[in-house]
């Protein structure tokens, strides 16, 4: 069974940011800014054809 | 530090797992200057089909 889409789970550390409780709440400015920067960054990295997008962003303490 | 976890979606056959990781790793320097994000400990794996069918591409 083929969906025509490949999915990859990616995890990484951002060592110059501090985790706090606002990263557990998607309505906070901190959460939304970081999510926007990360989404924009991935569009830059995988700008060649084939990249469909990202989902399920989660932030955890490092 | 902050650990970021996410799912990436690509058209099937357009990229292998090695290049997903390599292209991300090669961008780390630019991420630091452009977004002020110091990235380390990158890990990439493929998502088994049943999970990926549910997750969709955002």
């Amino acid at each position: 069974l083929s969906t025509g889409v490949s999915f990859f789970f990616l995890s990484f550390h951002i060592s110059n940011l501090q985790f706090n409780s606002s990263l557990e709440d998607p309505s906070t400015d901190y959460y939304q800014e970081l999510q926007r920067d990360i989404s924009e960054m991935f569009l830059q990295i995988y700008k060649q054809g084939g990249f469909l997008g990202l989902s399920n962003i989660k932030f955890r303490p490092g | 530090s902050v650990v970021v976890q996410l799912t990436l979606a690509f058209r099937e056959g357009t990229i292998n797992v090695h290049d997903v990781e390599t292209q991300f790793n090669q961008y780390k320097t630019e991420a630091a200057s452009r977004y002020n994000l110091t990235i380390s400990d990158v890990s990439v794996s493929d998502v088994p089909f049943p999970f990926s069918a549910q997750s969709g591409a955002g």
Epitope: Q48 | G13, I15, N16, V17, T22, Q26, D46
Partner: antibody, heavy 120, light 107 residues
Framework: QVQLVQSGAEVKKPGASVKVSCKAS????????MHWVRQAPGQGLEWMGY????????HYNQKFKDRVTITADKSASTAYMELSSLRSEDTAVYYC?????????????WGQGTLVTVSS | DIQMTQSPSSLSASVGDRVTITCRAS??????LVWYQQKPGKSPKLLIY???TLTSGVPSRFSGSGSGTQYTLTISSLQPEDVATYYC?????????FGQGTKLEIK
């Protein structure tokens, strides 16, 4: 037409190093990744590593990581593979092979091969 | 590392026979599977990539199939010029391992 022309056969003593060259022509050298593969006499193919000549990014098979160095000279459209601390088991034909362009996961052109013999 | 296991390691068949070579990966390689043909004393030649896409100039008697961990190269009607060793290759993740090869001979 695309051509990958490799340097000639070499005979080396154990412990020495060898540097094999691969001169590319007929395409833009910096836009295709170049891999190195070896084949011991009567044996199968073994992937050693690659270089992206545009960015100079390299990735090596862990088996060879401490002994192999792959480089590229953009101005000469030439890739090099240097293997150090040679031992008799390194006697093989060494091939350069071009990986197809974006989303092309295969080796579409191969060099003619360079026989490296390690013998005391 | 992903191990690639080819079978059989050698086979002998008659001209006109249908020949099948299989390649098993130790993990899912998501169709990033390549087949090469190598004739004695020559460099390998690309036959099939993405498990089933035939390279331009390769005769249509060659075909590839499979998915996940199991892949097959089929020659529908063996010709004398098909005498060679055939290799599969994992192109999903490094190291980009090859199968040990299948030596094909004519009876």
């Amino acid at each position: 037409q695309v051509q990958l022309v490799q340097s000639g056969a070499e005979v080396k003593k154990p412990g020495a190093s060898v540097k094999v060259s691969c001169k590319a022509s007929g395409y833009t050298f910096t836009t295709y990744t170049m891999h190195w593969v070896r084949q011991a006499p009567g044996q199968g193919l073994e992937w050693m590593g690659y270089i992206n000549p545009g960015s100079d990014y390299t990735h090596y098979n862990q088996k060879f990581k401490d002994r192999v160095t792959i480089t590229a000279d953009k101005s000469a459209s030439t890739a090099y593979m240097e293997l150090s601390s040679l031992r008799s088991e390194d006697t093989a034909v060494y091939y350069c092979a071009r990986q197809g362009n974006y989303a092309a996961y295969y080796f579409d052109y191969w060099g003619q091969g360079t026989l490296v013999t390690v013998s005391s | 590392d992903i191990q690639m296991t080819q079978s059989p390691s050698s086979l002998s068949a008659s001209v006109g026979d249908r020949v099948t070579i299989t390649c098993r990966a130790s993990g899912n390689i998501h169709n990033f599977l390549v087949w090469y043909q190598q004739k004695p004393g020559k460099s390998p030649k690309l036959l099939i990539y993405n498990a089933k896409t035939l390279t331009s100039g390769v005769p249509s008697r060659f075909s590839g199939s499979g998915s996940g961990t199991q892949y097959t190269l089929t020659i529908s009607s063996l010709q004398p010029e098909d005498v060679a060793t055939y290799y599969c290759q994992n192109f999903w993740n490094v190291p980009f391992t090859f199968g040990q090869g299948t030596k094909l001979e004519i009876k």
